[in-house]
Amino acid sequence: SERCDDWGLDTMRQIQVFEDEPARIKCPLFEHFLKFNYSTAHSAGLTLIWYWTRQDRDLEEPINFRLPENRISKEKDVLWFRPTLLNDTGNYTCMLRNTTYCSKVAFPLEVVQKDSCFNSPMKLPVHKLYIEYGIQRITCPNVDGYFPSSVKPTITWYMGCYKIQNFNNVIPEGMNLSFLIAFISNNGNYTCVVTYPENGRTFHLTRTLTVKVVGSPKNAVPPVIHSPNDHVVYEKEPGEELLIPCTVYFSFLMDSRNEVWWTIDGKKPDDIPIDVTINESISHSRTEDETRTQILSIKKVTSEDLKRSYVCHARSAKGEVAKAATVKQKVPAPRYTVELACGFGATHHHHHH
């Protein structure tokens, strides 16, 4: 057959769906690869063709759209399963073509099983709630397009293995779950089960997300540099190793980039002709406040290096701060006191440091 623009296997879209539940999968061509939508393509006389390769097989085969109760169907640019079966797992291809044009992309579809605590291999989205911040809501995700607005589904919410009822601060409100006030104890996996009728049949949609309670913007502060500080002096002799830690606390801020960096004499360490290494470590509190430590290390420091200015800088969405380290050359104690030796003929006193 004639050439076809093949976008290959789009592993960025690793689609996971639950066994025995409806799934609607849009052809990724129109979402991520082509500059026109399905309606435009359809109007231009292009046809969308679906086929698949079963798991652990190489053979591409057409999708059977003649199954009982139209279990698999196509509607515009959407492939529908009503419902899925475990052996629907495989690589699916949608191809858009006419006599002069052809474009196709494949994507993996994994049908997964869940247990009665909603555990499964499914990758879970994370929703962050601010600690003690007032009413916040999570919404049952990815249920749009499954049923018309005239249908009134039932929605049951669970935390882990338990149906949410009589929880002090968590209230189910249809598609939303309201947290009157969020605490660390609200961390966990929350599942909504949406049940709806369609053409005389009943379907479930199960959606699980992870709730993570994080620091509140009410309590957020600019970065705080704990080290270097005014109480510690880095006093070294030439030839010794100089180690200066820069330890910075960052309040949790949604979508904030936290940065820590050193300057030496106002320049980046890379721009200074000395052998500097910088090692960074990051730790998080339970509410995702962050502590970053960058240790500046000069293996064999020179007297020149000990005269330089070492400044730790930190920046977040809340502001920028800087703190200089106090670095000194250690003054060696004299081997003996010259004045005493000369003036009084005293014995030599050796001071070893």
Partner: antibody, heavy 117, light 107 residues
Amino acid sequence: EVQLVQSGAEVKKPGSSVKVSCKASGYTFNSYWIHWVRQAPGQGLEWMGYNNPTSGYSEYNQKFTDRVTITADKSTSTAYMELSSLRSEDTAVYYCAREYGDLFAYWGQGTLVTVSS
Amino acid sequence: AIQMTQSPSSLSASVGDRVTITCKASENVGYSVSWFQQKPGKSPKLLIYGASNRYTGVPSRFSGSGSATDFTLTISSLQPEDFATYHCGQIYIYPYTFGGGTKVEIK
């Protein structure tokens, strides 16, 4: 095809215990909760409690808390309901039912337990 | 526990009649009410969930309505196979509770 098949009828003496089984087939057993509901002769339905086969957790109707134990054996896909200290008013048909998302869509055929001296 | 009061406890009707059964909850249960049909010697069968949604395979002559505390099951045109006992149940909060049942008999 989803099926819940319960054990046969039982006649018990007051003060004794009964253990009713419910064998599930046609679906993945540990994906659904199993509830137990009873119905005294000519009466309505009465919820006794449920078991979550994954966690092993059971929740009971307080009316039965001290007397009922609901368990599940994942290896045989079987749920059990044990009721102790039986009295004549426990004479009833006992049903197991599979639940998901608040839907009691599949029920066992029922087990008649008669408590009589 | 939430009480579910079902009425009437029994009714006589003819084939083709419109039949209405009501259920009243002692507290707000939202839409979390199911209706079941039970024939003598058989286990209950789910008809309606979420107060108004017909379960798979249930004929369209069965409909449910209501919210909060007042719920109704309607059979628009009674058929011979509909003579049975009907139960409402709240699936809102433990312990789940059921009405006393309504027996629909042939007139």
